[in-house]
Interface confidence: low
Amino acid sequence: PEPPTACREKQYLINSQCCSLCQPGQKLVSDCTEFTETECLPCGESEFLDTWNRETHCHQHKYCDPNLGLRVQQKGTSETDTICTCEEGWHCTSEACESCVLHRSCSPGFGVKQIATGVSDTICEPCPVGFFSNVSSAFEKCHPWTSCETKDLVVQQAGTNKTDVVCGPQDRLRA
């Protein structure tokens, strides 16, 4: 091979020479010289660097602020940031999960299609014919109308998307 004119992966060019980058979890203390390796030091408590780098300072772990409804989902390491999620009943407002809002409830006439998670809101769907929801809820699905026939009853009042059918006794045939 010819003498090098560029550095390879996991190296960086400085003062016309190639130095090894610091591995994830470590920061740069001093560049290499012709006789010495790059000097790196581990990140401190509550700090991280997640790539091969030449950073002189580690990044601070994210703070999951309980005042914003946040809690720690995964504790950070020297190589990874802390991952925040939201308290029960709340979900993140963005992918970065910097704050939380209450889960949406599905109004009467709508049921829960997908229950909310820490990162996604409740997904509601209109109750189709034959189903109803008479409550505002973040958990309840649309319920099927009661089957009067199976109870040997008849429909006295038709159901809607917000109400169940009302069943009653069958009219007796007079002799």
Partner: antibody
Framework: QVQLVQSGAEVKKPGASVKVSCKAS????????MNWVRQAPGQGLEWMGN????????NYNQKFKGRVTMTTDTSTSTAYMELRSLRSDDTAVYYC????????????WGQGTTVTVSS | DIVMTQTPLSLPVTPGEPASISCRSS???????????LHWYLQKPGQSPQLLIY???NRFFGVPDRFSGSGSGTDFTLKISRVEAEDVGVYYC?????????FGGGTKVEIK
């Protein structure tokens, strides 16, 4: 500190193969090419080739092409040189040597491995 | 292949006196980046070779300043300003600009 520690002496019969190892420590193994140089008894130095442990690319001296294979195991920071179809004139001390990045010279050498080929 | 020719083959020296070794290459060792890829190694008795001078004039880590390299293109010189007893051994010049990298035949430095 940089250290290259080679495997022990070998005695082989003509036609056999030998595989010499070189364990590196004290530096980022994948960042530096590893070279192999041999020295026949009472003779000078002869460059056999080198390997880039990061990509696995090799450069062989044409004289040994087809007979030599250089490999690395990055998990153990070890380089290997295998020489096949040994002849009596392959009797030599075999050295591994690191290629300095900026120096483009062989800055650290192993202690050498004596390979004797004799029937 | 680039042929590296060293002279003399043997060099008897007196401690405290200067010494000089010559090396000639069959092709220029100057790269387009202006570096000259000519190096000097010393092999002390019973030891592995060690790097003394790299890229024509640069002393390697820990090498005493009594060693110096010079030259240009195809003619090179290693000088020892005042030889010491520990300097005995075989000195090799080498090139790393064209594959295969090659070494000179060596110059044996011994105390008179």
């Amino acid at each position: 500190q940089v250290q290259l520690v080679q495997s022990g002496a070998e005695v082989k019969k003509p036609g056999a193969s030998v595989k010499v190892s070189c364990k590196a420590s004290g530096y980022t193994f994948t960042g530096y090419n590893m070279n192999w140089v041999r020295q026949a008894p009472g003779q000078g130095l002869e460059w056999m080739g080198n390997i880039d442990p990061y990509y696995g690319n090799t450069n062989y001296n044409q004289k040994f092409k087809g007979r030599v294979t250089m490999t690395t195991d990055t998990s153990t920071s070890t380089a290997y040189m295998e020489l096949r179809s040994l002849r009596s004139d392959d009797t030599a001390v075999y050295y591994c040597a690191r290629l300095g990045l900026q120096l483009y010279a062989l800055d650290y050498w192993g202690q050498g491995t004596t390979v004797t080929v004799s029937s | 292949d680039i042929v590296m020719t060293q002279t003399p083959l043997s060099l008897p020296v007196t401690p405290g006196e200067p010494a000089s070794i010559s090396c000639r290459s069959s092709q220029s060792l100057v790269h387009s980046n202006a570096n000259t890829y000519l190096h000097w190694y010393l092999q002390k008795p019973g030891q592995s070779p060690q790097l003394l001078i790299y890229k024509l004039t640069n002393r390697f880590f820990g090498v005493p300043d009594r060693f110096s390299g010079s030259g240009s293109g195809t003619d090179f010189t290693l000088k020892i300003s005042r030889v010491e007893a520990e300097d005995v051994g075989v000195y090799y010049c080498s090139q790393s600009i064209h594959v295969p990298w090659t070494f000179g035949g060596g110059t044996k430095v011994e105390i008179k």
